[in-house]
């Protein structure tokens, strides 16, 4: 950066080189050039000469004043006009930064994705700080009182092998930068309660021609967790509202869920699972698109209306469960 140049003088910033965005700041330049009594001192920001708010303090020093400085980063340098020199002489340079102190980290969440071998902790960092902000994740065993600290700039993956202090832990996050430090509330976790099953994936769909054609969605997960609860949401791509089917699942075999869908319509499906009774869900699976065949079922409209959903479709499943409506919108 510009701070690596050879200086013939000194440049400094008040209140500091890293300061709160929107502050008024002063940049001082003091020349110390052999055989030079500077006629004039010039300031440059990002290579562009500044014209205003420059005050000469004495023979060797000048001040540049900025009101309400809002740039996250700027490279400053100053030069002197020396007698008998055609060009300006470089005095010194400095990189300056403005930003904000960190917000209190909140929504601290720790999960163990099955087979990952890691506990992944994330949090809401709050507003953008614009300056280098580090986070220290504290993990304290409630059984041994032993505390471990992990330094990161975003989220953290902690090897489950390193969690030797039993199953119960307190987790909290400290955020710090040059402008301040904040600490989150403590999150109490039990390692057995934060496991998210291996991702559920929809593999294919088929429509079976029967008196009333039915669509079978095939889906699976590599999870070894015995008790898993899942949701499958689906809708016609022209509809706004998701329909959600909930069921308990045993992944010792590929799952088959049956749907009675309207003909010649494009549908989208997604699935997600959690260990039954636990807190955290998988993210929704990749979008699975399926278009039903054109054949219209040969039944009376009255028969077709029996037990239909409000979007004109019905659902059954090999797994037990019930159907709910979900207005969460188009979440990918």
């Amino acid at each position: 950066g510009i701070t690596n140049i050879n200086c013939s003088g000194h440049i400094w910033v008040e209140p500091a080189t890293i300061f709160k965005m929107g502050m008024n700041i002063s940049i001082y330049c003091q020349a110390a050039i052999k055989n030079c009594q500077p006629r004039k001192l010039h300031f440059y920001k990002n290579g562009i000469k500044e014209r205003f708010q420059i005050t000469r303090i004495n023979k060797t020093t000048a001040r540049l004043w900025y009101k309400n400085f809002l740039e996250p980063h700027a490279s400053m340098y100053c030069t002197a006009e020396c007698p008998k020199h055609f060009q300006e002489t470089l005095i010194c340079g400095k990189d300056i930064s403005s930003g904000y102190p960190p917000d209190i980290p909140d929504e601290v969440t720790c999960v163990i994705y099955e087979y990952s071998g890691n506990m992944t902790c994330t949090w809401n960092a709050g507003k953008l700080t614009y300056i280098d902000t580090k986070y220290v994740v504290h993990v304290k065993s409630l059984e041994t009182e032993e505390e471990q600290q992990y330094l990161t700039s975003s989220y953290i993956n902690i090897s489950t092998d390193s969690l030797q202090g039993g199953k119960k832990y307190l987790v909290w996050v400290q955020a710090a930068n040059a402008l301040g430090m904040e600490e989150s509330k403590q999150l109490q976790i039990h390692l057995d309660d934060i496991v998210i099953p291996s991702a559920a994936v929809i593999s294919r769909a088929e429509t079976i021609n029967a008196t009333v054609p039915k669509t079978i969605i095939y889906w699976d997960s590599q999870t070894t967790i015995e008790k898993v609860s899942c949701e499958m949401r689906y809708k016609a791509t022209t509809n706004q509202t998701w329909n959600v089917k909930e069921f308990d699942t045993n992944f010792t075999y590929v799952q088959q869920s049956e749907f009675y869908l309207e003909p010649n319509i494009k549908y989208v499906f997604q699935v997600r699972c959690q260990e039954t009774g636990k807190r955290y869900w998988q993210p929704w699976s990749s979008l699975f698109f399926h278009k039903t065949p054109e054949t219209v079922p040969q039944v009376t409209s009255k028969a077709f209306q029996h037990d239909t959903w409000n979007s004109g479709l019905t659902v059954a499943s090999i797994s037990t469960g019930h159907l709910t409506s979900d207005n969460r919108g188009d979440i990918g």
């Epitope: 994936v201 929809i202 593999s203 294919r204 769909a205 088929e206 429509t207 669509t215 791509t237 010649n264 494009k266 989208v268 990749s286 979008l287 699975f288 698109f289 399926h290 278009k291 039903t292 065949p293 054109e294 188009d330 979440i331 990918g332």
Partner: antibody, heavy 120, light 111 residues
């Protein structure tokens, strides 16, 4: 190794019908959709239609009345039939696959194409 | 049907320059948090090749010189820096709605 291979008649007389077969390997037609795209000499790509894994079809609005797409999953073959051909149907005809159950949701593998010339 | 308008129709660049190709859809091609817009490269005598899927994702094996951006109706394919091997015709395609539609293509030539 994923492959698609088009085979067609090469030359078709005006007002006659065109039949092209796309034979695929390395993936299942029950899980992937297959699209047909054509390209007249020196011109751009034109989407003709598709057959979903389920067997359902979608067609280019302007060609819908002349087109039909079918498939035989067990033989790994997809069939394009186009009726009432005219000279402006002369083109390179391609088949391509799309997976609609995850990324990329795009035509990631294409056949080399088969040339169809409509002429008397 | 969604109409895809590509610009420019052609451009000639020197090696090392940046190529920017634009594609505008007549209506949004976004749904479920994705932009169903893809970019293909076609060289003479060859079928098209997928470069970018879902607006900004680089297909496996495609050089990092290629990048895609945009959402809803306005999309851009960027090649930076351009190499001799990039001389080809580039097409955008949407499959948010059936019927799928392609842009008319942009021919990239080397000066």
């Amino acid at each position: 190794d994923v492959q698609l291979q088009e085979s067609g008649p090469g030359l078709v007389a005006p007002s006659q019908s065109l039949s092209i077969t796309c034979t695929v390997s390395g993936f299942s037609l029950s899980r992937y959709s297959v699209h047909w795209v054509r390209q007249p000499p020196g011109k751009g790509l034109e989407w003709l239609g598709m057959i979903w894994g389920s067997g359902s079809t979608d067609y280019n609005s302007a060609l819908k009345s002349r087109l039909s797409i079918n498939k035989d999953n067990s033989k790994s073959q997809v069939f394009l039939k186009m009726n009432s051909l005219q000279t402006d149907d002369t083109a390179m005809y391609y088949c391509a696959r799309v997976y609609y159950g995850g990324s990329p949701y795009a035509m990631d593998y294409w056949g080399q194409g088969t040339t169809v010339t409509v002429s008397s | 049907d969604i109409v895809m308008t590509q610009s420019p129709a052609s451009l000639a660049l020197s090696l090392g320059q940046r190529a920017t190709i634009s594609c505008r859809a007549s209506e949004s091609v976004d749904s479920y948090g994705n932009s169903f817009m893809h970019w293909y490269q076609q060289k003479p005598g060859q079928p098209p090749k997928l470069l970018i899927y879902l607006a900004s994702n680089l297909e496996s094996g495609v050089p990092a010189r290629f990048s895609g951006s945009g959402s809803r109706t306005d999309f851009t394919l960027t090649i930076d820096p351009v190499e001799a091997d990039d001389a080809a015709i580039y097409y955008c395609q949407q499959n948010n709605e059936e019927p799928n539609t392609f842009g008319a293509g942009t021919k990239l030539e080397m000066k």
